[in-house]
């Protein structure tokens, strides 16, 4: 389609005459406000179709949209249409008139809408106001469409100034139908019960006045109906509750319980389901693995945690070396068992600033009248290594010895290293590791002892140096899982008179 002039926006003089032409490969027609105004249609020798719309004695009321579309009963593939918007600035026309339908805007949800107040002159400044207020609202204006935005359930007017007079539009009314969607919540006093105990479920709806409840449950499927009770919890907003109560539950009552709520006015519905388990007798089950050997670091706090499932709620006891533990008044031990869901529990033993004496055999026992479970582990207290002694001696044999003694838990490893260039070591030159069996110039002898009372290992290592011809820095490093410690000593040759 080809439109002359092409637009898409034209500003024409009042009282003037103007010609619009549209041409295309099939019959074309001009449309204005869903009507076909009088126009001249023609077909050229080259097969081109055209339509000429002559606008005479233009007034502000001619302001608006004009469309050129194909007018072909053969139904061309294309839905092509060309839009042109014409302004005819006319001081005698304030706002363009609206149909009644355009003055009342009806909504069921929060969505962007347009308040279609339009003027004849694109240069005019137009503002939007609540009908009862003078303050202009910060809403974007399009001269071809009006004010677009999200509007509250109020009445609005548009204002503009033409010359020196202020002009008001008709009032526009926004009606929002507050359709309260149904929101159902279902909960049970307990989702796990033993046979013979009661099942009680509640289905609650908020904000609706007239609703219908329908329950489905395992007993219903076998034809054994239970009559629910419905009550109002609060007046505003409406809280309506349906209670389904099944006394003396049986194993067959296990399954899905569904509450379906409908309200007929707007045909809304919602449903929620909950699973109920009826067990023959109570249970206690450990969840997850706890290693049989646990570690704690000396003087640090350590929490040991056991997770388990149980119904009904169990009694939990902790033991150390078969003696019952309790919260100590000095705050050195803290015991807690908390319910993290209806049937899941976490029991924690916290040792504050761990001492060596707290190493030992620990047991947690959870039990009730139907079942019990216990879990045991050995607690090892890890002690960072300390080098307690590093000494050098000159036995008569002529060799020189360096003795290193240290303690820690778990057993420390010992690393000997030496540095020959005292000026550059250890910053520039890495120390040489000693004690490798292939080297003849040094020999290593290491003894390890476990001290039961202190519950730690002692390492004593002796390094024998065959011939020391210049001063040597010898370093002893002890390392274990929780730390390391180093000491060094300068070893000088026999020939030097000083130490």
């Amino acid at each position: 389609l080809v439109v002359t002039p092409p637009g898409p926006e034209l500003v024409l003089n009042v009282s003037s005459t103007f010609v619009l032409t549209c041409s295309g490969s099939a019959p074309v027609v001009w449309e204005r406000m869903s009507q076909e105004p009088p126009q001249e249609m023609a077909k050229a020798q080259d097969g081109t179709f055209s339509s000429v719309l002559t606008l005479t004695n233009l007034t502000g009321l001619d302001t608006g949209e004009y469309f050129c579309t194909h007018n072909d009963s053969r139904g061309l593939e294309t839905d092509e249409r060309k839009r042109l918007y014409i302004f005819v600035p006319d001081p005698t026309v304030g706002f363009l008139p609206n149909d009644a339908e355009e003055l009342f805007i009806f909504l069921t949800e929060i969505t962007e809408i347009t308040i279609p107040c339009r003027v004849t002159d694109p240069q005019l400044v137009v503002t939007l106001h609540e009908k009862k207020g003078d303050v202009a609202l910060p809403v974007p204006y399009d001269h071809q469409r009006g004010f677009s935005g999200i509007f509250e359930d109020r009445s609005y007017i548009c204002k503009t100034t033409i010359g020196d007079r202020e002009v008001d539009s008709d009032a526009y009314y926004v009606y929002r139908l507050q359709v309260s969607s149904i929101n159902v919540s279902v909960n049970a006093v307990q989702t796990v019960v033993r046979q013979g105990e009661n099942i009680t479920l509640m289905c609650i709806v908020i904000g609706n006045e007239v609703v219908n409840f329908e329950w489905t449950y395992p007993r219903k499927e076998s034809g054994r109906l239970v009559e629910p009770v419905t009550d109002f919890l609060l007046d505003m907003p409406y809280h309506i509750r349906s209670i389904l109560h099944i006394p003396s539950a049986e194993l067959e009552d296990s399954g899905t319980y569904t509450c379906n709520v409908t309200e007929s006015v707007n045909d809304h519905q919602d449903e929620k389901a909950i699973n109920i388990t009826v067990v023959e007798s109570g249970y206690v089950r450990l969840l997850g693995e706890v290693g049989t050997l646990q570690f704690a670091e000396l003087h640090r706090s350590r929490t040991l945690q056991v997770v388990f499932e149980a119904y009904p709620p169990p009694t939990v006891l902790w033991f150390k070396d078969n003696r019952t533990l309790g919260d100590s008044s000095a705050g050195e031990i803290a015991l807690s068992t908390r319910n993290v869901s209806e049937t899941r529990y976490v029991s924690e033993l916290t040792l504050v600033r761990v001492k060596v004496a707290e190493a030992g055999h620990y047991t947690m026992r959870a039990f009730h009248e139907d079942a019990e479970v216990q879990l045991s582990f050995q607690l090892q207290i890890n002690v960072p290594v300390r080098v307690l002694e590093l000494s050098e001696s000159h036995p008569d044999s002529g060799e020189q010895t360096v003795r290193c003694r240290g303690r820690g838990m778990p057993q420390p490893n010992i690393i000997w290293s030496a540095c020959r260039d005292l000026k550059r070591c250890p910053r520039e030159l890495p120390p040489t590791l000693l004690g490798n069996s292939s080297e003849e110039e040094s020999q290593l002898e290491t003894n390890v002892t476990y001290w039961e009372e202190e519950q730690e290992f002692e390492v004593v290592s002796t390094l024998r140096l065959q011939h020391v011809d210049r001063p040597l820095s010898v370093r002893c490093t002890l390392r274990n899982a929780v730390g390391q410690d180093t000491q060094e000593v300068i070893v000088v040759p026999h020939s030097l008179p000083f130490k």
């Epitope: 009862k132 359930d153 109020r154 009445s155 009314y173 009606y175 929002r176 139908l177």
Partner: nanobody, 116 residues
Amino acid sequence: QVQLVQSGAEVKKPGASVKVSCRASGYTFTNSFMQWVRQVPGQRLEWVGLSNPSGDYTVYAPKLQGRVTMTTDTATGTFYMELFSLRSDDTAVYYCATHGGDRSYWGQGTLVTVSS
């Protein structure tokens, strides 16, 4: 507080007519139109028409012109909307609504079902 209470659901055969009432209480009868709107399930609200409180001024949606009439009983404060020559596509929930300037007020809706 304005309250609008509508008549109950109706089931009609094609070609019949239906008259829906809307009783208004707490309503200032002089300053606001009573609107009638309908909603086919799953579709947008469609304007049906309006009448003024005294019942001497009505405007109908062009689509329904000639098939709809709106009247008012000022003594009881009841508005009526009557739709004639019912068709299956007239099946909808019909609402009356009015505007207080700072908010709108709605009836609870009346379901009209047209079915042979």
